[in-house]
Amino acid sequence: AVDLTLLANLRLTDPQRFFLTCVSGEAGAGRGSDAWGPPLLLEKDDRIVRTPPGPPLRLARNGSHQVTLRGFSKPSDLVGVFSCVGGAGARRTRVIYVHNSPGAHLLPDKVTHTVNKGDTAVLSARVHKEKQTDVIWKSNGSYFYTLDWHEAQDGRFLLQLPNVQPPSSGIYSATYLEASPLGSAFFRLIVRGCGAGRWGPGCTKECPGCLHGGVCHDHDGECVCPPGFTGTRCEQACREGRFGQSCQEQCPGISGCRGLTFCLPDPYGCSCGSGWRGSQCQEACAPGHFGADCRLQCQCQNGGTCDRFSGCVCPSGWHGVHCEKSDRIPQILNMASELEFNLETMPRINCAAAGNPFPVRGSIELRKPDGTVLLSTKAIVEPEKTTAEFEVPRLVLADSGFWECRVSTSGGQDSRRFKVNVKVPPVPLAAPRLLTKQSRQLVVSPLVSFSGDGPISTVRLHYRPQDSTMDWSTIVVDPSENVTLMNLRPKTGYSVRVQLSRPGEGGEGAWGPPTLMTTDCPEPLLQPWLEGWHVEGTDRLRVSWSLPLVPGPLVGDGFLLRLWDGTRGQERRENVSSPQARTALLTGLTPGTHYQLDVQLYHCTLLGPASPPAHVLLPPSGPPAPRHLHAQALSDSEIQLTWKHPEALPGPISKYVVEVQVAGGAGDPLWIDVDRPEETSTIIRGLNASTRYLFRMRASIQGLGDWSNTVEESTLGNGLQAEGPVQESRAAEEGLDQ
């Protein structure tokens, strides 16, 4: 079972001093969202017992395995159900504490009732403040039964629940009719999933015989030991004031565990600590009683004395729960209550015994859960004991369970059961994850989900180039850290696999699935420099650059041009995808802007050093487009263009530029300047006959303006081919006169 304890401090004179603490003895408990599991949760559960809203409770984490709830302002804050949740994955466990008001009308004789499937459970509510009215019983907040107030027996209202089944488990309450729910008696009923002494899916397995009030868990057959006891069968008492599965926790305060209620995972429930009893766990056990809630009786023999925390303390020469066994009877010594081995290992198990007559090798045997008896292969005989060594055949999962070492001599016999846990070495369910890559190294997150059992003691990362038959390289890493694989080849695929190990011999699991991780290209090292640039318009810039000459092939896939507009805080990036390119036209720039310009060589995703930057000023934007452009063929080699000046000019036009292009032609267009800005007409000469041309034009002030609409016109007739278009301008009026 999960090592989880919910402690309730029951000093109820002052609710503000009341606190609940949840303590986990699990490895790595409560660390949060790392690979080792979720944190401890401690909260009030208002689903069944609703109390008036108050200020929120304060949750304080004390280290990684303890959480405390405080901030109770009035007694009604305490009434109800509290729960602590701890453990990870399938081991996630909820521990529940039910708090009753000491001033309630009805009080439970016993809060927690753990019963077996098929038993009859009897809940008893003691009358504390009498009301001559009906008593309403509820189960998990819903109506369950009514008792007439005349049905009280010896001042108690009893609810009999015959033949209980696991679904009957839950919170029960007894309340006087139409009285405040805070005056109720609250109970917790835990119904084990099996009959007495049985556990397992079909209840076919036999419980180990839990001692000292321990309760056999119906799922795993383990004993959930009362606070203050430990061991596979709860056979060992902790020192006073200690609790936890290994007695590792200490009760807070100078009065030890006085005034504390301990709640443990089901099917145990809650009780006082060992040596204490009473509704507030403040009364010491009466003479002759010991253990949690003082439920156990000592009945010591042969001069043994009763200790209220541990039971019988035997005089020299005697041992046993009641000091009933003479030391002359053989006795198993110092047998661990629990051993852990990995699947398919062949461990050696030692079992030591003493007694009179002295045990010899043949008198000590080891019995497996399936009844197989192993005889020792060798024995070490010392003056005070004999230690038999057993070589265990290859372990299988079915070997998990309770083993028994037994010694028999003519003086009698003794046996000691111990639990063997056969653990499955962990096997990764997924491949490791690539975090970052460079040309010669890969950074990998190795810890993945796995099948089998933890904890993970070591992580091995195996890697080699893809499709290689060479030996795998291996690196052993800390489970919680990322791994850097170094000294790799650039631009190479590597097959990477994880192998996990758990503690102990044979704890190495099978390798996990492979994944392909590819190193990056080598970084480009050449630094380009900018040869020059010229403005081809208010928003166009042509840039050229060079690279230093070096022997060997060029390491690079292309160039990245960067334009930084410092005024607006904007960067423009232009990708030139040919490593042979040495020039680029940048368009769509912002007119009238200062740019800082540089160029870098890139290879894969890596950038080389940037060129020294250049500073470029684009001219401001030009004037609007000329209006109503019109073309009229005059001859087989001449076409006249007419237009109207642009509107809303920001200044005087310095010239017009006409663009001439053969319709459907593949060649570059021809630009012709009209240097007399007052003109609104021009004749383009030297054209080819019977040829369709496209024309558009724009004005220039400080910079070139927007293009006009494009017009089409064909030259006339079938004349000779001209040498190429030229232009003649005149004022529109003059053209009309002609």
């Epitope: 009301k131 001559q132 009215t133 009906d134 309403i136 509820k138 819903s142 109506y143 369950f144 039964y145 009514t146 008792l147 007439d148 005349h150 049905e151 009719l177 139409e178």
Partner: antibody
Framework: EVQLLESGGGLVQPGGSLRLSCAAS????????MFWVRQAPGKGLEWVSG????????RYADSVKGRFTISRDNSKNTLYLQMNSLRAEDTAVYYC???????????WGQGTLVTVSS | QSELTQPPSVSVAPGQTAVITCGGS??????VHWYQQKSGQAPVLVVF???DRPSGIPERFSGSNSGNTATLTITRVEVGDEADYYC???????????FGGGTRLTAL
């Protein structure tokens, strides 16, 4: 679905007897306190009698004490009201009702009419 | 024994708010329950424990209780709300259930 179905009503002469039944379904009958409530024609509701789950404890209104007997058979999920020495003022619709977890009636039957007349 | 007093009738226009009272000595110290009984039908619990509504009862029905008067309030009254309404308490002195005389609600 909780259902309560009364039967056994009818015309009876003063001084006569009648036994009403209430068949319950849709809930665990043996856990609930059950009641009879009546309503005279054109009048309000009047509580008549109640019985606890075990059947061992009963309650009666003063107007019927000594004449009416409430009982139940948990194995048959049925509530009964044995009415003796009937009077004209016992003429009413008799309702069977279930008590909830408070002092209220959360489910009622449709009622059965008892007429006491010569 | 408790005596519960209700007005014989209350009339409101549809869409308005109806308030039905139930008077009794220190009724605020008891839990009051309200039932609706439409003509020719069995009573139906509409409010219990002063102010709680069973599932299926519209939010238009609400209750309150203090001093010597408990109140059933029906907002946005509909024609379908026309019925007799009874208050009820449990008399802890006699262990009897006590009903008020009933109030007929009419939607004008």
């Amino acid at each position: 679905e909780v259902q309560l179905l009364e039967s056994g009503g009818g015309l009876v002469q003063p001084g006569g007897s009648l036994r009403l039944s209430c068949a319950a379904s849709g809930f665990t009958f043996s856990r609930y306190v059950m009641f009879w409530v009546r309503q005279a024609p054109g009048k309000g509701l009047e509580w008549v009698s109640g019985i606890y789950p075990s059947g061992g404890h009963t309650r009666y209104a003063d107007s019927v004490k000594g004449r009416f007997t409430i009982s139940r058979d948990n194995s048959k999920n049925t509530l009964y009201l044995q009415m003796n020495s009937l009077r004209a003022e016992d003429t009413a619709v008799y309702y069977c009702a279930r008590r909830g977890s408070g002092g209220y009636f959360d489910y009622w039957g449709q009622g059965t009419l008892v007429t006491v007349s010569s | 024994q408790s005596e519960l007093t209700q007005p014989p009738s209350v009339s409101v226009a549809p869409g308005q708010t109806a308030v039905i009272t139930c008077g009794g000595s220190n009724i605020g110290g008891k839990s009051v329950h309200w039932y609706q009984q439409k003509s020719g039908q069995a009573p139906v619990l509409v409010v219990f424990d002063d102010r709680d509504r069973p599932s299926g009862i519209p939010e238009r029905f609400s209750g309150s209780n203090s001093g010597n008067t408990a109140t059933l309030t029906i907002t946005r009254v509909e024609v379908g709300d026309e019925a007799d309404y009874y208050c009820q308490v449990w008399d802890s002195g006699t262990d009897h259930r006590v009903f008020g005389g009933g109030t007929r609600l009419t939607a004008l």
